[in-house]
Amino acid sequence: ALDAAYCFRNVQDNCCLRPLYIDFKRDLGWKWIHEPKGYNANFCAGACPYLWSSDTQHSRVLSLYNTINPEASASPCCVSQDLEPLTILYYIGKTPKIEQLSNMIVKSCKCS
Amino acid sequence: ALDAAYCFRNVQDNCCLRPLYIDFKRDLGWKWIHEPKGYNANFCAGACPYLWSSDTQHSRVLSLYNTINPEASASPCCVSQDLEPLTILYYIGKTPKIEQLSNMIVKSCKCS
């Protein structure tokens, strides 16, 4: 799997999980979130050569098409596969609120 | 939706469905498929600017992060959303076989 266990241990130009820390205030302008101040969001990036973690029949076909037609602009792209939620604490006036935000952290990637 | 109805009627640099006809023999080297000779596979391509058809909370966050940090390499990517199968006819000796290949045709796209 193109997850932290594999991608963070190997120097990989191909599609892989990349580390990305997002500071809510600095990077997004969200000043109202009390905790956490930021989080490891991660992201997916890298080339999708022939059959590198292809997600669907179409991405396999596209990857083969690209190998045979290298001048073509049609190629699979490296995107998130598994995502996890993030729990935040914020205040409505003096009242603390806890919210679970879905699909905020990328855990693994795929070529799609 | 970033489908044929929208994308094939509008000149769109952003993420959209693009027409792609694949000839099985010429483009993939698959000589054994009897019918069809090829098919409209289509593919997804184009930029994923701020909130352009964002797929998940993470892609929204990444898109906003990219707006505020334009030098960053972390940005969403244009990939397939809805896929459809393709039915093919081939022969095992003299015996005709009909097979439905799943996820072969891209019908719409998203930024993920």
């Epitope: 997004l28 302008g29 109202w32 205040y91 006036g93 009242t95 919210e99 | 909130l51 929204r60 906003l64």
Partner: antibody, heavy 121, light 107 residues
Framework: EVQLVQSGAEVKKPGASVKVSCKTS????????MNWVRQAPGAGLDWMGQ????????NYNEMFEGRVTLTADTSTSTAYMELSSLRAGDIAVYYC??????????????WGQGTLVTVSS | DIVMTQTPPSLSVSPRETASISCRAS??????????MHWYLQKPGQSPQLLIY???NLESGVSDRFSGSGSGTDFTLRISRVEANDTGVYYC?????????FGQGTK
């Protein structure tokens, strides 16, 4: 230039629902909370609730709880307020107003032009 | 809920004079070193506009003839060298407690 442009005046029958839109431009829609405030004829301001468009998180004033629904469409940077079970007491100008940004519950620095909702049989 | 009471309900001021409006909260609106009190002006036929943020901070683009002061439960908006263009209804607003609430207005 930050702009909040609201939909036009509405006339509704008692018991019906109304949906008011607030199209924004000139700022990053998913960075700020959007508030809704109403003002009955010749009266003061009543805060109805708020939404954080990035996630659709909402916070309602209990006075309106159950009758008001706030939504947001991030693809068009538009916020919506729907009020159901309309009665004569709901005749008012409804405003969308952007939160200042430092807190979830905050002052409001930009306001829409207002939408007059009339309830009449 | 925090109730905001403004005085006076209405006020008539001659040009170039100073006007003062008071706002009293039913309980303290101070938290974390800030006073969560703001002031707005609603001119006739217009939407409200923010004048003062966090009790005493002048909003960008607002004339420095407007000033705010106070803490805890008692707050004051002062308008010096009053102009005809200052005509309207002034509202105070707290956001220290949910639900956010406004004063009834001073005309």
């Amino acid at each position: 230039e930050v702009q909040l442009v609201q939909s036009g005046a509405e006339v509704k029958k008692p018991g019906a629902s109304v949906k008011v839109s607030c199209k924004t431009s000139g700022y990053t829609f998913i960075t700020y909370w959007m508030n809704w405030v109403r003002q009955a004829p010749g009266a003061g301001l009543d805060w109805m609730g708020q939404i954080f468009p990035a996630w659709g998180m909402t916070n309602y004033n209990e006075m309106f709880e159950g009758r008001v629904t706030l939504t947001a469409d991030t693809s068009t940077s538009t916020a919506y307020m729907e009020l159901s079970s309309l009665r004569a007491g709901d005749i008012a100008v409804y405003y969308c107003a952007r939160g200042y940004g430092n807190y979830a519950l905050d002052a409001m620095d930009y306001w829409g032009q207002g939408t007059l909702v009339t309830v009449s049989s | 809920d925090i109730v905001m009471t403004q005085t006076p309900p209405s006020l008539s001021v001659s040009p170039r004079e100073t006007a003062s409006i008071s706002c009293r909260a039913s309980e303290s609106v101070d938290s974390y070193g800030n006073s969560f009190m703001h002031w707005y002006l609603q001119k006739p036929g217009q939407s409200p506009q923010l004048l003062i943020y966090l009790a005493s901070n002048l909003e960008s683009g607002v004339s420095d003839r407007f000033s705010g002061s106070g803490s805890g439960t008692d707050f004051t908006l002062r308008i010096s060298r009053v102009e005809a263009n200052d005509t309207g209804v002034y509202y105070c607003q707290q956001n220290d407690e949910d639900p956010l609430s406004f004063g009834q207005g001073t005309k």
